[in-house]
């Protein structure tokens, strides 16, 4: 049994890091393998992650971590029984994929303005809380070409757009994702999408 593709890990910089790897053949990850991880710190304890299958030869493990900070570094040991298959390390702050924003809501009752709001996925005491920027994707269910991205580079989790910038009388969907420049993160997954019917009063022609 050999590792074909070494584990690569990403952290949500809060409580979970996800590691994925590939074996050289079909593997029952949860019964045959264990991923041991330990913070390089005074008094830290070793933890064991039981991997799940991710395709025939692929495995994925969700590592639970407390109080993730930029100074943290973890040792990783992948075991098959008594055999050490791979040894490595992982610094969560250097491989961050933020959590997806939540509670995306479209407020249509503001005069001819659409107000989109969502929730920051981090608590205020997490460093990323004040460092997320967002991308909002709005698209028409009727017209695949009517697809737009709005970059929200300020901290407030909201976006205002004129309803007239979208077509009236048709349904739209929106979703939002986040990233943080400070840790050069990847983009988060998209939030679940929300749907609304766009209607506004056309101005009278003179």
């Amino acid at each position: 049994m050999k590792v074909l593709q070494e584990p690569t890990c990403v952290s949500d910089y809060m409580s979970i890091s996800t590691c994925e790897w590939k074996m050289n053949g079909p593997t029952n990850c949860s019964t045959e393998l264990r991923l041991l991880y330990q913070l390089v710190f005074l008094l830290s304890e070793a933890h064991t992650c039981i991997p799940e299958n991710n395709g025939g030869a692929g495995c994925v493990c969700h590592l639970l971590m407390d109080d993730v900070v930029s100074a943290d570094n973890y040792t990783l040991d992948l075991w098959a029984g008594q055999q050490l298959l791979w040894k490595g390390s992982f610094k969560p702050s250097e491989h961050v994929k933020p959590r997806a924003p939540g509670n995306l809501t479209v407020h249509t009752n503001v005069s001819d303005t659409l107000l989109l709001t969502w929730s920051n996925p981090y608590p205020p005491d997490n460093y990323l809380y004040n460092h997320l920027t967002y991308a909002v994707n709005i698209w028409s269910e009727n017209d695949p070409a009517d697809f737009r991205i709005y970059n929200v580079t300020y901290l407030e989790p909201s976006l205002r757009i004129a309803a007239s910038t979208l077509k009236s009388g048709i349904s739209y969907r929106a979703r939002v994702r986040a990233w943080a420049q400070c840790y050069n993160t990847t983009w988060s997954e998209w939030s679940p999408s929300t749907k609304w019917h766009n209607s506004y009063r056309e101005p009278f022609e003179q």
Epitope: F41, L42, L43, S44, E45, D66, D67, A71, D72, D125
Partner: antibody
Amino acid sequence: QVQLVQSGAEVKKPGASVKVSCKASGYAFTSYYMHWARQAPGQGLEWMGIINPSGGSTSYAQKFQGRVTMTRDTSTSTVYMELSSLRSEDTAVYYCARGKWWLYNWGKGTLVTVSS
Amino acid sequence: QSVLTQPPSVSAAPGQKVTISCSGGSSNIGNSYVSWYQQLPGTAPKLLIYDNNKRPSGIPDRFSGSKSGTSATLAITGLQTGDEADYYCGTWDTSPPTKPLFGTGTKLTVL
């Protein structure tokens, strides 16, 4: 919000022991290390040791080895610091502080006076 | 005796800028992360800067930290009378046995 509430001031005689408590609230108690530091009157901060509330393991500064004991009670989210064989130089304010590489939150401190 | 050396005192007028240095060595500041703590008179220390240059939420951007080699600096701009306090740097001694270290402390007086 995070709170670290320490026990009240103590006056002890040389040779005696003192046990200071620090009750934590507002966060997951076992997820964060707890440090103890002290500050003698008019002096700077001095690190004493650290406890991992999850398993109860400890590490102490060499200066206090053999005299200090740190424990925790997960049922009450409280950590304790006991210092024995007290001498006058141990007169200080004793602080518990939550954190790992740096100390996010500090208790208000407990003044321990050692005097005959 | 702390191996992190700070000036015993610094002073400046309100509105001015002041810097406080923290000098260490390759086995501590040079190989670890620096934090800064503010201790107002009669109170417990409070985290001001961590990870060399990051501010916890609620700390104004008048406070900034930097690190270069084996020394670190805390800068305070737009000094206010409420900034009058003792300031301590902190880091880790990475040579066994690893342990946290505090600087000698600096008394800031706002004139």
